[in-house]
Each structure stands twice: as C-alpha cells, then as structure tokens.
C-alpha cells in the first residue's frame, strides 16, 4: 500500500507536471507568430483511456513530437528551451508511471491539436491530484 510520504511525492510530481503543461499552454495562447497556424495543424494522438498513472505512457510517446512542434515557435514565451522543458517533463513522467512496467498505450481514433492535447493532460493531472488530496 502506498505510504503517506510516497503519496505526497506523487502529488508534488503531478503538480510540477501540471504547472509545466499549463506553462506550455499559456505560452501558445499568448503566442503571435506566423508559425502558430502551422503548429495548430499538427495532430497529436490522444489516449483512449487516461485514469491511472500508467496511462502516462501515452503522454511520454507524444513528448518528442510535442518538442518538435514547440521548436517551431523559436519564442521567448517559454522560460526554458523546448528541449529542456520536454526533458524535465519526461523525467517526471518516467518517475510517475514507473519504468519497470511495460504498458502498451491505446490511442483514441480522433487526433487533437496541441491545445486540445495539452488540455487533456492538464485535466488528467488535476483529476489524479484530486484523488490524492
């Protein structure tokens, strides 16, 4: 059974992930550049189901394209370079989902824009955090 300290650690990691995802979303929403149109044309894969930490595998697999889409911005809207930002997120995701379990992600049929994609994972973090508090 999870201890109170491990639950607290998980909660803090989820809050950190949530803040990173919100920062990216805010950066995109405040971003005015010809490349924004191009960024919004990229279709991200969404999880068929996202209710447990193991489902973060679906986020992990989309982090590379997310980085490359964000790279288009070449913007000061993010405090960190996309590479560093995504690297930070990747570390958190790996810790949260655990690397010892091999979970095959199942994707939904519909794809999503970067904004819809980020909102989906922000909702996921908020949902899990609410079950921990």
């Amino acid at each position: 059974a999870p201890t109170s300290s491990s639950t607290k650690k998980t909660q803090l990691q989820l809050e950190h992930l949530l803040l990173d995802l919100q920062m990216i979303l805010n950066g995109i929403n405040n971003y005015k550049n010809p490349k924004l149109t191009r960024m919004l044309t990229f279709k991200f894969y969404m999880p068929k189901k996202a209710t447990e930490l193991k489902h973060l595998q679906c986020l992990e697999e989309e982090l590379k394209p997310l980085e490359e889409v964000l790279n288009l911005a070449q913007s000061k809207n993010f405090h960190l370079r996309p590479r560093d930002l995504i690297s930070n997120i990747n570390v958190i995701v790996l810790e949260l989902k655990g690397s010892e379990t091999t979970f095959m992600c199942e994707y939904a049929d519909e794809t999503a824009t970067i904004v819809e994609f980020l909102n989906r994972w922000i909702t996921f973090c908020q949902s899990i955090i609410s079950t921990l508090t």
Epitope: F42, Y45, E61, K64, P65, C105
Partner: antibody
Framework: QVQLVQSGAEVKKPGASVKVSCKAS????????INWVRQATGQGLEWMGW????????GYAQKFQGRVTMTRNTSISTAYMELSSLRSEDTAVYYC???????????WGQGTLVTVSS | DIQMTQSPSSLSASVGDRVTITCRAS??????LGWYQQKPGKAPKRLIY???SLQSGVPSRFSGSGSGTEFTLTISSLQPEDFATYYC?????????FGQGTKVEIK
C-alpha cells in the same frame, strides 16, 4: 529510443525480386508512416514512396509504380519494401525512414545494399 | 513533380569558414523543406525541418532560412565533423524530391 533496423545485404539476378524489411522499435509503429528512399553508389537520394502502417495505405513515386510494393506486419512492427523486375540500375542502398505529417524523415534505418548482377 | 535545385554541387572550405548552401524549388513550397547531412557509408541525418527549425541535438552553428522557392542552409563556423554531403528535401506534395546534394570538402 527510436530505432529502425533493416535486413541485411542482398545480391540478386536481373529480373528477380527483392524484399527488404525494416523493424521499428521505441515508438508506436502505427503512429508514423514508413518511407523508402534509395541511393545508388556515389549518387543522390531518391524518394520511392510511403506506407501508413495503421491503414496499409501506400503511395509510390511514378518511376516505381507497378514494380514496388510496400507492406507491413503490425504485430511485429515491421515494414517491407519489395521491388520486382530488378535491373542493374536498381543496385543501391535502400533506406527506410519514418514520418508523421510535416515531421518528415526524422529517423532512418541503417540502409540495405541491394546488388543486381548477373 | 517539384524540382529542387541545389547550389553549389560542391565546395571547398576551411575550418572556421562560414558556409552557405542554397536550394531553389521549381514552384512555391511554403516552408515544407528539410535539410539533411550525410557522411560516407551512413544514413542521412535531419538537421533542419520546416525550413528554419533546428533538430534537437544539432549544433546551433547550423541554421536554415527562406520560404516559398528560395532556401538556405548556413553553417556559421565550419567544424571538422561538418565535412559531408548536404541535401534539401521538399515534402509539400508527392512525390517528395531531394536536391542533388552539396559536397562540402576540406580546402
């Protein structure tokens, strides 16, 4: 990490067929198209076509239409490129590379040398 | 088919030189262009995508510019490991087409 591993070198006679494989790992195979690009010795790169592993849909450069077939086996995350009616001009290194929308040819296989000689 | 004309076909340069390679498309391709580096016996490696975006892990001395029909790859200060052949690729429409390549040699 993402890897595309291709089958070994082949020597074929003119008129024969060759089938090159490309095994993907480190990502969800059905999320990215597989493209095939060839390069004759000392020459430039030539795009041959694409295959969507999810649907099996394909698109070939006109030059190879009727001679090339691109297929896949999703259960083993492997794509195949078969070229028939081989001639000496088909002697080249054949590469597979993945793409997704406008993120194109970001990872490549190591290449497979196909030699056509009588 | 869209023709991609690369120039020069080869060039000799010294370490530390600024090198510029140009790619011209036979019709407008927006920014649907990538730049690739290839060393002998190796698979090509993507340097630049969508005309100007630097591939993660690629040194910042590489940069891409242009849109429409005129594109440029610039190496701000050539390093020993940069001696290779460079190709542009258009991917706005099928069939995708590469430039004929630019071989960068040591002077």
């Amino acid at each position: 990490q993402v890897q595309l591993v291709q089958s070994g070198a082949e020597v074929k006679k003119p008129g024969a067929s060759v089938k090159v494989s490309c095994k993907a790992s480190g990502y969800t195979f059905t999320n990215y198209d597989i493209n095939w690009v060839r390069q004759a010795t000392g020459q430039g790169l030539e795009w041959m076509g694409w295959m969507n592993p999810n649907s099996g849909n394909t698109g070939y450069a006109q030059k190879f239409q009727g001679r090339v077939t691109m297929t896949r086996n999703t259960s083993i995350s492997t794509a195949y490129m078969e070229l028939s009616s081989l001639r000496s001009e088909d002697t080249a290194v054949y590469y597979c590379a993945r793409s997704r929308q406008w993120l194109v040819l970001d990872y490549w296989g190591q290449g497979t040398l196909v030699t056509v000689s009588s | 088919d869209i023709q991609m004309t690369q120039s020069p076909s080869s060039l000799s340069a010294s370490v530390g030189d600024r090198v510029t390679i140009t790619c011209r498309a036979s019709q407008g391709i927006r920014d649907d262009l990538g730049w690739y580096q290839q060393k002998p016996g190796k698979a090509p490696k993507r340097l630049i995508y969508i005309a100007t975006s630097l591939q993660s892990g690629v040194p910042s001395r590489f940069s891409g510019s242009g849109s429409g029909t005129e594109f440029t790859l610039t190496i701000s200060s050539l390093q020993p490991e940069d001696f290779a052949t460079y190709y542009c690729l258009q991917h706005i429409s099928y069939p995708w087409t590469f430039g004929q390549g630019t071989k960068v040699e040591i002077k």
